[in-house]
């Protein structure tokens, strides 16, 4: 056995992968390598066996640079059959390589063809359907012919694929099925003698569904109390388990352990293992592990056990001693950091009274008080009382809760009008915002100007996203401000701030905003400030009731900030249905600073033009059509008649006189005055009164004497009356004439 080149793996004196020797012979194996090495033997060969001798690796080979070791096994037996391996020690440089050499030694014994014999009691072999199954009937000689049989009459023949034979391992079944469940045996006939070794395959369900320990971790006990831990393992129907415990006192068997099976579930097994220690001591504290094994399946569950000499309470604030929350929150948890054992009794006080009696919204959860649907009433001092009566231990701790409220503007919550109010032009107006919040909000007033064009209608003239300006009493933005003031008032039991803005002279339309803010949030109320020069923002007027042949003149004036689509319509009733006939549209309207005017003129009316005339306009905010109606009754025409004829009349010179010609007719008659058949025009000293119905002559002279005639005329005809006016005190010349 020469010393050639460097040995990457150790070299054995017996070449090849296997070697057959007879029982009773001596096995001699030498191992040579570049480094120190060790031997690995079959499990059936005990290192303590007197027949076994292994020399430690010593220098050998050329220049003594190699290591040699020998293994000697005197009087080898059949059960010494197995794999013998020489491997470099892991500390050497070759540890990364496969630094070992092995040889399988068959110790042939005609009387023991099988290494292990199971005759009376079959060896239990766990199997899982669909997985590899090995029936481990290893033999002492590779030449032994072995047959695999299944009770009672079946023979499982190796086919080189699903079932194969390996003299070192036994029968290998690639994927086991239910057919391999049951009693199997390996048979070998040597020198006419039949040898049988039996195996019972147990189908492993191996399905551990769940492992739990009750009570849950951590388990806390006082010195002298009893520890009871219940470990439950839930498995599939036909699954067996082995349950064991690891715990601090296991070495001294501190615990008693009982096991039982709960069969109340139709498709599961529930295995219980109950660990019990009476009179626990400090030494029992630590980790308790329940280990559950089923074939190749394994699960474990831990729980930690704490043992205290005596009870204790320690309580601290989890947050600050003064805590803040916000009204309207779904819940708020007031929590204390408590360490105590055993579990103390807990009472929460609010302002000195038991909290849970004060309101059903207070729930105790562990060392926390949960306040549901937080309101301002929940502000106050909260005290946790902790007590362990048996240990005569009591502790308390107080936390203050402040309930903040986002600002609220009372006027916003009151149902607002569907369309904004109108403020009469030039009027003094008082605008109010009533505000509540915790902390007390700061209130500012703002002005959003309306950039509107007087000459054309604009319905979107005033948008809230336009630039806004903060106001103070001296502001000259928008309308003149008389004052901005604030006062505190109690409304419905709470302190509210009333902020008032007084507008001295309503001239400019826009939006006033009151803004209230605190650290919780901001709220804003917009007051649309629409100025109107029209009473109630909508007015209809009829110049006069026309007579047949006259002109009908109607006028409709609406506030332009509130209304659009202005139209005159005539309402007619046909078959008990009111029909709307549009007779004048918006395009004929004129737009002023604050209003839109639409005039309706119907020339030369006839009786058929009588009816209900309505001005219709659409409210910009509600979309509702508003109608203002006026009844028009066209009067029937009649010829003029005088209420009283003129009569001759005497007047003193330089005096004054009035001639009265009252006429009626439809349409109203036109009155014309004549003197001596000449039409009288108004001139100094001659005054024609209203509708020409009176003629007034001041400082009468002798030239004013004569025949005066009045004529009343309309389309239907004319009527006249005459009288002689005598002027007294005239000159002789006049008398002579």
């Amino acid at each position: 056995y020469g010393s050639g080149s460097k040995l990457k793996v150790p070299e054995l004196s017996l070449k090849g992968t296997q070697h057959v020797m007879q029982a009773g012979q001596t096995l001699f194996l030498k191992c040579r390598g570049e480094a120190a090495h060790s031997w690995s033997l079959p499990t059936t060969v005990s290192q303590e066996d007197k027949r076994l001798s292994i020399t430690p690796p010593s220098a050998c080979g050329r220049d003594n640079r190699q290591f040699c070791s020998t293994l000697t096994l005197d009087t080898a037996q059949a059960n010494h059959t197995g794999l013998y391996t020489c491997r470099y020690l892991p500390t050497s440089t070759s540890k990364k390589k496969k630094a070992e050499s092995s040889i399988y030694i068959f110790v042939s014994d005609a009387g023991s063809p099988f290494i292990e014999m199971h005759t009376d009691i079959p060896k239990l072999v766990h199997m899982t359907e669909g997985r590899q199954l090995i029936i481990p009937c290893r033999v002492t000689s590779p030449n032994v012919t072995v047959t695999l049989k299944k009770f009672p009459f079946d023979t499982l023949t190796p086919d080189g694929q699903r079932i194969t034979w390996d003299s070192r391992r036994g029968f290998i079944i690639a994927n086991a099925t239910y057919k391999e469940i049951g009693l199997l045996n390996c048979e070998a006939t040597v020198n006419g003698h039949l040898y049988q070794t039996n195996y019972l395959t147990h189908r492993q369900t191996n399905t551990i569904l769940d492992v739990q320990i009750r009570p849950p971790s951590p388990v806390r006990l006082l010195h002298g109390q009893t520890l009871v831990l219940n470990c439950t393992a839930t498995t599939e129907l036909n699954t067996r388990v082995q349950m064991s415990w690891n715990y601090p006192g296991k070495a001294t068997k501190r615990a008693s352990i009982r096991q039982r099976i709960d069969r109340s579930h139709s498709h599961n097994n529930v295995f219980h293992s109950v660990l019990k220690i009476n009179n626990v001591e400090s030494r029992d504290k630590g980790l308790y592990t329940c280990r559950v094994k089923s074939g190749s399946s394994f699960q474990s569950f831990n729980t930690s056990v704490h043992v205290y000499e005596k009870g204790f309470i320690s309580v601290k604030h989890r947050k600050q001693p003064v805590q803040e929350t916000t009204a309207g929150r779904r819940s708020y948890r007031l929590s204390m950091k408590v360490k105590a054992f055993p579990s103390p009794e807990i009472v929460w006080l609010k302002d000195g009274s038991p909290a849970t009696l004060k309101s059903a919204r207070y729930l105790v959860h562990g060392y926390s008080l949960i306040i549901k649907d937080v309101t301002t009433e929940d502000a106050g001092d909260y005290t946790i009382l902790l007590g362990i009566k048996q240990s005569r231990l009591f502790k308390n701790l107080t936390a203050t809760l402040i309930v903040n409220v986002k600002p609220q503007i009372y006027e916003k919550s009151v149902s607002s009008l569907p369309s904004p109010p109108l403020y009469p032009l030039g009027s003094r107006q008082v605008l109010t915002c009533t505000v509540y919040g915790i902390p007390r909000p700061t209130i500012t007033w703002l002005w959003h100007p309306c950039h509107h064009n007087h000459s054309k209608e604009r319905y979107d003239f005033c948008t809230e996203n336009e630039e806004s300006f903060i106001l103070d009493p001296s502001s000259n933005l928008g309308n003149r401000i008389e004052s901005i003031s604030q006062r505190m008032t109690v409304i419905e039991g709470t302190n509210k701030t009333v902020s008032t803005l007084v507008v001295a002279d309503s001239q400019t339309p826009g939006i006033y905003s009151c803004r209230a803010f605190n650290k919780i949030g901001t709220v804003e109320r917009n007051i649309k400030f629409y100025v109107t020069d029209v009473p109630n923002g909508f007015h209809v007027s009829l110049e006069k009731m026309p007579a047949e042949g006259e002109d009908l003149k109607l006028s409709c004036v609406v506030n332009k900030f509130l209304y659009r689509d202005i139209t005159w319509i005539l309402l007619r009733t046909v078959n008990n249905r009111t029909m709307h006939h549009s007779i004048s549209k918006q395009k004929m309207a004129t737009t002023q600073d604050y209003s839109i005017t639409l005039n309706l003129v119907i020339k030369n009316v006839s009786l058929e033009d009588s009816g209900t005339y309505a001005c219709r306009a659409r409210n910009i905010y509600t979309g509702e059509d508003i109608l203002r109606k006026t009844e028009v009754l066209v009067r029937d025409s009649e010829a003029p008649h005088l209420l009283q004829n003129l009569s001759d009349y005497e007047v003193s010179i330089s005096g004054s006189t009035t001639l009265d010609c009252q006429a009626r007719g439809v349409p109203a008659p036109q009155i014309t005055w004549f003197k001596n058949n000449h039409k009288i025009q108004q001139e100094p000293g001659i005054i024609l009164g209203p509708g020409n119905s009176t003629l007034f002559i001041e400082r009468v002279t002798e030239e004013d004497e004569g025949v005066y005639r009045c004529r009343a005329t309309n389309q239907k005809g004319a009527v006249e009356s005459a009288a002689y006016l005598t002027v007294q005190g005239t000159s002789d010349k006049s008398n002579l004439e």
Epitope: G182, N238, S266, H267
Partner: antibody
Framework: QVQLKESGPGLVRPSETLSLTCTVS????????LSWVRRPSGKGPEWLGR???????TYNSAFKSRLTISRDTSKDQVFLKMNSLQTDDTGTYYC?????????WGQGVMVTVSS | DIVMTQTPVSMSVSLGGQVSISCRSS???????????LSWYIQKPSQSPQLLIY???NRVSGISDRFSGSGSGTDFTLKINKIEPDDLGVYYC?????????FGSGTKLEIK
């Protein structure tokens, strides 16, 4: 291969006791649970009870007072004893391996309860 | 007890055809570990019952894929495609979720 075979009398007098035997092969009674199921003529099957792999038993509460299931593992046999039989106990009685539900059944034994 | 109701009681079908058998339980068959233990069995003439499907939809090894199970909670269905002469018999559903284990009263399948 897995086999189950029921045996016992075909005729039983009213108020007497029914004794049936189920002999199994191809599996171990130590590994599998086994149930008895009967099918009264013209009706659906009825589960009577289960013998667990470790020898424990669970019975249908409707039959608990008059039913006993036991086994002899060395003989691979399971026994059913039902007393106080009435005519409506007539039907076919099966033993069935109880694993993935009832995966193997015996051929059944027809039992008539009549005087 | 959980009552299992099968419909129809019987049905006649042509070879190559398809059938659906319904099974309804009086309460949910979902077990505390989340499994649903509903099985289907066939009993062919003068034979003992044979397991076809377990846990609602799992076919037993060796059972043709013409058989399929579905459903959840309380409503379950067995479908058989491409009916063959060997498929005739009585089909039963059974529950193994709660004691006592119970079965439906059966659906008899006949070939036209």
């Amino acid at each position: 291969q897995v086999q189950l075979k029921e045996s016992g009398p075909g005729l039983v007098r009213p108020s007497e006791t029914l004794s049936l035997t189920c002999t199994v092969s191809g599996f171990s009674l130590s590994d599998y649970s086994l149930s008895w199921v009967r099918r009264p003529s013209g009706k659906g099957p009825e589960w009577l009870g289960r013998l667990w792999f470790d020898g424990d038993t669970t019975y249908n509460s409707a039959f608990k007072s008059r039913l006993t299931i036991s086994r002899d593992t060395s003989k691979d046999q399971v026994f059913l004893k039902m007393n106080s039989l009435q005519t409506d106990d007539t039907g076919t009685y099966y033993c069935t391996r109880d694993d993935r539900d009832f995966d193997y059944w015996g051929q059944g034994v027809m039992v008539t309860v009549s005087s | 007890d959980i009552v299992m109701t099968q419909t129809p009681v019987s049905m006649s079908v042509s070879l190559g055809g398809q059938v659906s058998i319904s099974c309804r339980s009086s309460q949910s068959l979902v077990n505390n570990n989340g499994n649903t233990y509903l099985s289907w069995y066939i009993q062919k003439p003068s034979q003992s019952p044979q397991l076809l499907i377990y846990k609602v939809s799992n076919r037993v090894s060796g059972i043709s894929d013409r058989f399929s199970g579905s459903g959840s909670g309380t409503d379950f269905t067995l479908k058989i495609n491409k009916i063959e002469p060997d498929d005739l018999g009585v089909y039963y559903c059974g529950q193994n979720t709660q004691y006592p284990l119970t079965f439906g009263s059966g659906t008899k399948l006949e070939i036209k």
